[in-house]
Amino acid sequence: KIDTPQRGSIQDINHRVWVLQDQTLIAVPRKDRMSPVTIALISCRHVETLEKDRGNPIYLGLNGLNLCLMCAKVGDQPTLQLKEKDIMDLYNQPEPVKSFLFYHSQSGRNSTFESVAFPGWFIAVSSEGGCPLILTQELGKANTTDFGLTMLF
C-alpha cells in the first residue's frame, strides 16, 4: 500500500507541458529554461467506496508546492481550480474528498483525468495552447483530454 505521493511529469499529445503562472496551470510548448511543474499524485485510500471500472481515483497536486487540483461549480459550470492544500491531508481524510478526486484512466500511453465530483467532466487544455487547464464535457477537437503521464522514480 503506497502512502506517499508519487511524482510524475505530464504533457499532452502536442508535447505541451503544464506550467504554473500566477497560481494558474497553463499548457505551453516545452522550451529551454522552462520549468514544467512536477505532479504529485496519490490514490484515494477509500477506493472501495467509489465507482468501480471508471479509473483509479487519485488526488492530484503540484509537487513541493502545497497546491492541489480541485473541481468546484462557478454558477452552473464546473471549473478546475488550484487550492492551497497538502495532498496527504486529503489522502488521510476519513472519507473521499470528491472535489479533489479524479478518476485516472490509462489507454496505452494516454491518460485521462475525470472529475469524481462532476462525472463526465475531464481535465483538458484548449487545442490552441498557452491556455489555462479547464474542465470539459466535450471530448472533441477543440480540447485535448488525453495526456502523457510519466512517473518519476
Epitope: 477509500h46 472501495e48 467506496t49 467509489l50 465507482e51 491531508d89 488521510n92 481524510q93 476519513p94 472519507e95 474528498v97 470528491k98 472535489s99 465530483a117
Partner: antibody, heavy 121, light 109 residues
C-alpha cells in the same frame, strides 16, 4: 435553507422491519454523505452507517451489517434507513445527518429531528 | 471494537473555562482519529461543532476549540455562556468506522 426532515414515529412488533426516511432540502443530496446514528433511551449515540447518495456506496458499523440497509432516491432527495428483524433493543431515536467537507475537514453540520422507533409486543 | 469514553457530567460558571475530553480504549487519540464534536441542546437539533480534531465548523463561535490533550481528544469552551448548557458528544474514526462517546452533560451554573 438546509434541512433534513425525517418521517414520523413508528411502533413495530419484534421480528418486523421498519423504513425511516430523511428528506433533504436546500442542497444537492448528491454533493455530500448522509450518516445514520441512533440513540437508545438514556444512552449515547451509536453510528449505524453512511451512504454516498451520488453513487449509492455504503459503509456500516460491523454491528449493523445485515441489520441496517441504507438507500437513497436522488430524484426525491430522500435517504432511507431500513432495519430488519427488529428486537426490543432496537428501540431508539434514529437520526440522519449530513457529513460534509468544508475546506479542511468533514463535519456533521446538519441533522434531522430524529425518528423514534419503538419495538414492543 | 473500540470504546470511547467521556465525562458523564461537568459544571462550569458563566464566563468560565471548561474542557471536555474523549478517551479511546485502544490507546492515545491522534489526529488520525479525526475527532468530531457535536452539541445537543434540549428541544433543538444536534449541531456539529468540530471536525478533524481542531477545525471549527462554519458558524461555530470561537469560544469552542478542539485539540489533543494528554492522549485524549478535547473540546475546550472558553467564556461559557448560559446557552452553552447542552449535551456534547465526541466521535472518533477507527479506519473505516466511526465510534461515538456516551456524551457529557454540561451545566452552566
Amino acid at each position: 435553507q438546509v434541512q433534513l426532515v425525517q418521517s414520523g414515529a413508528e411502533v413495530k412488533k419484534p421480528g418486523a422491519s421498519v423504513k425511516v426516511s430523511c428528506k433533504a432540502s436546500g442542497f444537492n443530496i448528491k454533493d455530500t454523505y448522509i450518516y445514520w446514528v441512533r440513540q437508545a433511551p438514556g444512552q449515547g449515540l451509536e453510528w449505524i452507517g453512511r451512504i454516498d447518495p451520488a453513487i449509492g456506496t455504503t459503509r456500516y458499523d460491523p454491528k449493523f451489517q445485515g441489520k441496517a440497509t441504507l438507500t437513497t432516491d436522488t430524484s426525491t432527495s430522500t435517504a432511507y434507513l431500513e432495519l430488519s428483524s427488529l428486537r426490543s433493543e432496537d428501540t431508539a431515536v434514529y437520526y440522519c445527518a449530513r457529513y460534509d467537507y468544508s475546506g479542511s475537514s468533514f463535519y456533521f453540520d446538519y441533522w434531522g429531528q430524529g425518528t423514534l422507533v419503538t419495538v414492543s409486543s | 471494537q473500540a470504546v470511547v469514553t467521556q465525562e458523564p457530567s461537568l459544571t462550569v460558571s458563566p464566563g468560565g473555562t471548561v474542557t471536555l475530553t474523549c478517551r479511546s480504549s485502544t490507546g492515545a487519540v491522534t489526529t488520525s482519529n479525526y475527532a468530531n464534536w457535536v452539541q445537543e441542546k434540549p428541544g433543538q437539533l444536534f449541531t456539529g461543532l468540530i471536525g478533524g480534531t481542531n477545525d471549527r465548523a462554519p458558524g461555530v463561535p470561537a469560544r469552542f476549540s478542539g485539540s489533543l490533550l494528554g492522549g485524549k481528544a478535547a473540546l475546550t469552551l472558553s467564556g461559557a455562556q448560559p446557552e452553552d448548557e447542552a449535551d456534547y458528544f465526541c466521535a472518533l474514526w477507527y479506519s473505516n468506522h466511526l465510534v461515538f462517546g456516551g456524551g457529557t452533560k454540561l451545566t452552566v451554573l
